[in-house]
Interface confidence: low
């Protein structure tokens, strides 16, 4: 069994926004400027994040919470807590190591971020293509040709699906 500690850790009394200062006989000292402690009982304060360059400040640092960053226009956040800013591309493009590249035929991206994805294969659901896909938009699937009433005009069925390519790196 575990014995209960007879002496309480003096640092446990230090609230958020302070640190237990070993250099001053473990008294609770306020976090210095540009630092914070978000929980009690800390032996150090953490340096505030600085939102520089492509990062901009979404929330200022306080003694009890870190600054929060987002990205300047033309970039978007990636990673935990916006740890990185990635360049935006246009709709119909994806970001590669060589910059923004147009989506390959058969793929689309309707956002300024992320990757090109294959058009929906309508025939897999027994449907036909109602509106053709573009680099920016997925195809729109309509009713299956059999569902169309006689005499109704039918959109040309799609070519056989092929494995979509990827933008060159």
């Amino acid at each position: 069994f575990e014995r209960t500690r007879s002496l309480q850790d003096p640092c446990s009394n230090c609230p958020a926004g302070t640190f237990c200062d070993n250099n001053r006989n473990q008294i609770c000292s306020p976090c210095p400027p540009n630092s914070f402690s978000s929980a009690g009982g800390q032996r150090t304060c953490d340096i505030c994040r600085q939102c520089k360059g492509v990062f901009r400040t979404r929330k200022e640092c306080s003694s009890t919470s870190n600054a929060e960053c987002d990205c300047t226009p033309g970039f978007h956040c990636l990673g935990a807590g916006c740890s990185m800013c990635e360049q935006d591309c246009k709709q119909g493009q994806e970001l590669t190591k060589k910059g923004c590249k147009d989506c390959c035929f058969g793929t689309f991206n309707d956002q300024k971020r992320g990757i090109c994805r294959p058009w929906t294969n309508c025939s897999l659901d027994g449907k036909s293509v109602l509106v053709n896909g573009t680099k920016e938009r997925d195809v729109v699937c309509g009713p299956s040709p059999a569902d169309l009433s006689p005499g109704a005009s039918s959109v040309t069925p799609p070519a056989p699906a092929r494995e979509p390519g990827h933008s060159p790196q």
């Epitope: 340096i47 994040r49 600085q50 520089k52 360059g53 492509v54 970039f75 990636l78 990673g79 935990a80 740890s83 990185m84 800013c85 990635e86 360049q87 970001l95 190591k97 990757i115 990827h166």
Partner: antibody, heavy 121, light 107 residues
Framework: QVQLVQSGAEVKKPGSSVKLSCKAS????????INWVRQAPGQGLEWMGN????????NYNQKFKDRVTLTVDKSTSTAYMELSSLRSEDTAVYYC??????????????WGQGTLVTVSS | DIQMTQSPSSLSASLGERVTITCKAS??????LSWYQQKPGKAPKLLIY???RLVDGVPSRFSGSGSGQDFTLTISSLQPEDIATYYC?????????FGGGTKVEIK
């Protein structure tokens, strides 16, 4: 060309500290995170933490948070990793590797040659 | 932390044979997975990122697939220079975590 050149092998006593360096060249030092990854003999890879040279912002693996300190010297484009309270299980090759700030998929694209740290009494 | 389970831990294959290595994440990591090759005494080398994108200069016999939790690295025709240990890495969340590695040997 991009190069990350690490300091030489170290032999340390248990309980002591070691400070390794990683000198970068061939790219804009401040635009890439420097990560530290270690590999114990015959074992896998383990991420320890990273630092963004522009503002020295750091992320640490909780496993190492109390023992690792990451710093940079922008004037020499050098990153440092200090590991304290060394124990025998810290014997490993320590690598520095980089990640581009602006492109999330550039994870660990270039690596240093590694530094062997041996902890032995 | 996200756990990455890589299998098999080692395999033996003949030259020219197709080799498949799998990596399973303990949670959805989108496509934020990369593959590394490491030869003895050397640093790892990035082969594939975003699950299926080949790094410039890496032979086309290497390919990656998968998304979500299940990922595969395939060597379509094993060559002598492919003898190495291969690691997957998830970078969807901090801390980035590696699989345990797969050692590929010649039969």
């Amino acid at each position: 060309q991009v190069q990350l050149v690490q300091s030489g092998a170290e032999v340390k006593k248990p309980g002591s500290s070691v400070k390794l360096s990683c000198k970068a060249s061939g790219y804009t030092f401040s635009s890439y995170w420097i990560n530290w990854v270690r590999q114990a003999p015959g074992q896998g890879l383990e991420w320890m933490g990273n630092i963004y040279p522009s503002d020295s912002y750091t992320n640490y693996n909780q496993k190492f948070k109390d023992r690792v300190t990451l710093t940079v010297d922008k004037s020499t484009s050098t990153a440092y990793m200090e590991l304290s309270s060394l124990r025998s299980e810290d014997t490993a090759v320590y690598y520095c590797t980089r990640t581009w700030e602006f492109y999330y998929d550039s994870v660990f694209d270039y690596w240093g040659q590694g530094t062997l740290v041996t902890v032995s009494s | 932390d996200i756990q990455m389970t890589q299998s098999p831990s080692s395999l033996s294959a003949s030259l020219g044979e197709r080799v498949t290595i799998t990596c399973k994440a303990s949670q959805d990591i989108n496509s934020y997975l990369s593959w590394y090759q490491q030869k003895p005494g050397k640093a790892p080398k990035l082969l594939i990122y975003r699950a299926n994108r080949l790094v410039d200069g890496v032979p086309s016999r290497f390919s990656g697939s998968g998304s979500g939790q299940d990922f595969t690295l395939t060597i379509s025709s094993l060559q002598p220079e492919d003898i190495a240990t291969y690691y997957c890495l998830q970078y969807d969340e901090l801390p980035p975590t590696f699989g345990g590695g797969t050692k590929v040997e010649i039969k």
